[in-house]
Amino acid sequence: RDKVMSEFNNNFRQQMENYPKNNHTASILDRMQADFKCCGAANYTDWEKIPSMSKNRVPDSCCINVTVGCGINFNEKAIHKEGCVEKIGGWLRKNVLEQKLISEEDLGGEQKLISEEDLHHHHHH
């Protein structure tokens, strides 16, 4: 399980690097951040380290009330402060890993962080 979490952490951070460059990656991360009410890998300050992201900006999907541009020049009180790796990892442990042995393909690869099916399952429960 620690290996799975470590993989997921590395993959999430890697996809954060791709966020400004890849629309598909961006939409997956946006959906995860919005659905799990989280921001960044460990926390929102991870977005400051992405070279092509302005330091006063997080994706709009980090906002508590998501509106276009809400992540620009954000106030800490207006965004989710919890990191996604802990939050999604905890949910994975509880809801997915205990139900099925998750393969590394399910967790990452180049495009998929969590299978669409799993995300859909979280969204409706």
Partner: antibody, heavy 119, light 108 residues
Framework: QVQLVESGGGLVKPRGSLRLSCAAS????????MNWIRQAPGKGLEWVSY????????YYADSVKGRFTISRDNAYNSLYLQMNSLRAEDTAVYYC????????????WGQGTTVTVSS | DIQMTQSPSSLSASVGDRVTITCRAS??????LNWYQQKPGKAPKLLIY???SLQSGVPSRFSGSGSGTDFTLTISSLQPEDFATYYC??????????FGQGTRLEIK
């Protein structure tokens, strides 16, 4: 009413140190980012530093980086600017400024405190 | 860093005149543009935020417009208390927070 009051300015020799304070009242202090902005005599406004609500994020203008340190104490509704290795070009009125962020603009300014660096 | 350029740097006008000050950003800043007024010996005061929204308590003769890189501050009918220095400032991409160099509005 909403108020920011700076203190701690004065005359200091080059390479000296000074600590500015800003006391906030009339609003929930940790709802806001806070800035220090300065204005040299007869010159325009220059941003010096800002700090996030929690104090986790701090940024500085290149001109003061490594010499100035911004901090805040939310329990005491206070903002600080520790200024070390002061130079003549740091001579200015220093303003403590409230920043709601997003597109709202810096909506509350203190009266300013004067820092003069001279031998 | 985003540079802000104001024009003119100084301006002479009479009470009752319509006055326009412009501010240009070195790259697009959407509508993240604010205008401040400063009188001698006083702290700046926020007039307009988000390019065109009037700050509470500011007289309606002040208005702002623009988006992207070009912005204007207009005073529809100058009053004696409006003679001051005006600054634009961007908050789209920070740090640093950047200001224009200021426009000094003087009595003709």
């Amino acid at each position: 009413q909403v108020q920011l009051v700076e203190s701690g300015g004065g005359l200091v020799k080059p390479r000296g140190s000074l600590r500015l304070s800003c006391a906030a009242s009339g609003f929930i202090f940790d709802d806001y980012f806070m800035n220090w902005i300065r204005q040299a005599p007869g010159k325009g406004l220059e941003w010096v530093s800002y700090i996030s609500n929690s104090g986790n994020t701090k940024y500085y203008a290149d001109s003061v980086k490594g010499r100035f340190t911004i901090s805040r104490d939310n329990a005491y509704n206070s903002l600080y600017l520790q200024m070390n290795s002061l130079r003549a070009e740091d001579t200015a009125v220093y303003y403590c400024v409230r920043d709601p962020r997003s597109y709202y603009g810096m909506d509350v300014w203190g009266q300013g405190t004067t820092v003069t660096v001279s031998s | 860093d985003i540079q802000m350029t104001q024009s003119p740097s100084s301006l002479s006008a009479s009470v009752g005149d319509r006055v326009t000050i412009t501010c240009r950003a070195s790259q697009s800043i959407s509508s993240y543009l604010n205008w401040y007024q400063q009188k001698p010996g006083k702290a700046p005061k926020l007039l307009i935020y988000a390019a065109s929204s009037l700050q509470s308590g500011v007289p309606s003769r002040f208005s702002g417009s623009g988006s992207g890189t070009d912005f204007t501050l207009t005073i529809s009918s100058l009053q004696p208390e409006d003679f001051a220095t005006y600054y634009c400032q961007q908050s789209y991409s920070t740090p640093p927070i950047t200001f224009g160099q200021g426009t000094r509005l003087e009595i003709k």
